[in-house]
């Protein structure tokens, strides 16, 4: 598992300290208090395609 | 089968201290979360504090902090609690319990207890 | 801290009556709500997370309700080994989750 400071998490998710693993950035939003949100801020979403030009 | 057995409770004065076990066996200890939950005999359950699986990062109820230590040996499949300057309102079953593998969701599993009574 | 409030704190009922159980948060928790059974002497027992998730092994006449500050648990016909003590918990709040006071169920 990474540990904090190696490589960092996919596109999208960030570091759990109370998890020990990478965390999705999506809960962030229904529950902000995560400890690994604050990385969030810093770690856009994945993109995603347009559906119009 | 999942099994958590706590241990090392017990009667003791005011001020004094104690250390709890947690033996868990039936799955593999390292990856989970754990906690430790208690409650006042007919009382309700109150958390008391949560370890990360490495036990890197761990929190504490402002009720127990600077007085309580959470830590853990995964070489031994083991929890541990460690209670400093016990208070009489410190009296109570103390349960370990698994975290579920997302953060802080549930717990899924529970030990029996160990009843620690704060008494002169 | 966010405070949980269950009513009623307590409710008799017969073998084979639905059981309503509520639990009403202090502030919005999103559906990060679970519910325990414990019975006397007996560690906790998870019935359901999330709001309405069915824990593995927990029969289906247990079911559960709700979001933001309004959440239900049901048991649609109560078994003799249901009669026991209920509580929700949050895990919203993190890390200070908090429990309901419970709702014990006995015997009418």
């Known amino acids: 598992e990474q540990a904090p400071g190696t490589a960092p998490c996919s596109r999208g998710s960030s570091w759990s300290a109370d998890l020990d693993k990478c965390a999705d950035c999506a809960s962030c939003r229904a529950r902000p208090h995560s400890d690994f949100c604050l990385g969030c801020a810093a770690a856009p979403p994945a993109p995603f395609r347009l559906l119009w030009p | 089968e999942v099994q958590l057995l706590e241990s090392g409770g017990g009667l003791v004065q005011p001020g004094g201290s104690l250390r709890l076990s947690c033996a868990a066996s039936?799955?593999?200890?390292?990856?989970?979360?754990m906690m430790w939950v208690r409650q006042a005999p007919g009382k309700g359950l109150e958390w008391v504090s949560y370890?990360?699986?490495?036990?890197?990062?761990?929190h504490y109820a402002d009720s127990v902090k600077g007085r309580f230590t959470i830590s853990r040996d995964n070489s031994k499949n083991t929890l541990y609690l460690q209670m400093n300057s016990l208070r009489a309102e410190d009296t109570a079953v103390y349960y370990c319990?698994?975290?579920?593998?997302?953060?802080?969701?549930?717990?899924?599993?529970w030990g029996q207890g160990t009843l620690v009574t704060v008494s002169s | 801290d966010i405070q949980m409030t269950q009513s009623p704190s307590s409710l008799s009922a017969s073998v084979g009556d639905r059981v309503t159980i509520t639990c009403r948060a202090s502030?919005?928790?999103?559906?990060?709500l679970n519910w325990y059974q414990q019975k006397p002497g007996k560690a906790p027992k998870l019935l359901i997370y999330?709001?309405?998730s069915l824990q593995s092994g927990v029969p289906s006449r247990f079911s559960g309700s709700g979001s933001g500050t309004d959440f239900t648990l049901t048991i649609s016909s109560l078994q003799p080994e249901d009669f026991a003590t209920y509580y929700c918990?949050?895990?919203?709040?993190?890390?200070?989750?908090?429990f309901g006071q419970g709702t014990k169920v006995e015997i009418k």
């Open positions: 918990q949050q895990s919203y709040s993190t890390p200070g989750i908090t």
């Open positions: 502030q919005s928790i999103s559906s990060y």
């Open positions: 319990a698994r975290g579920g593998d997302t953060y802080f969701d549930y717990f899924d599993y």
């Open positions: 370890i990360s699986p490495s036990g890197g990062s761990t």
């Open positions: 039936g799955f593999t200890f390292s990856p989970y979360p």
């Open positions: 999330a709001a309405s």
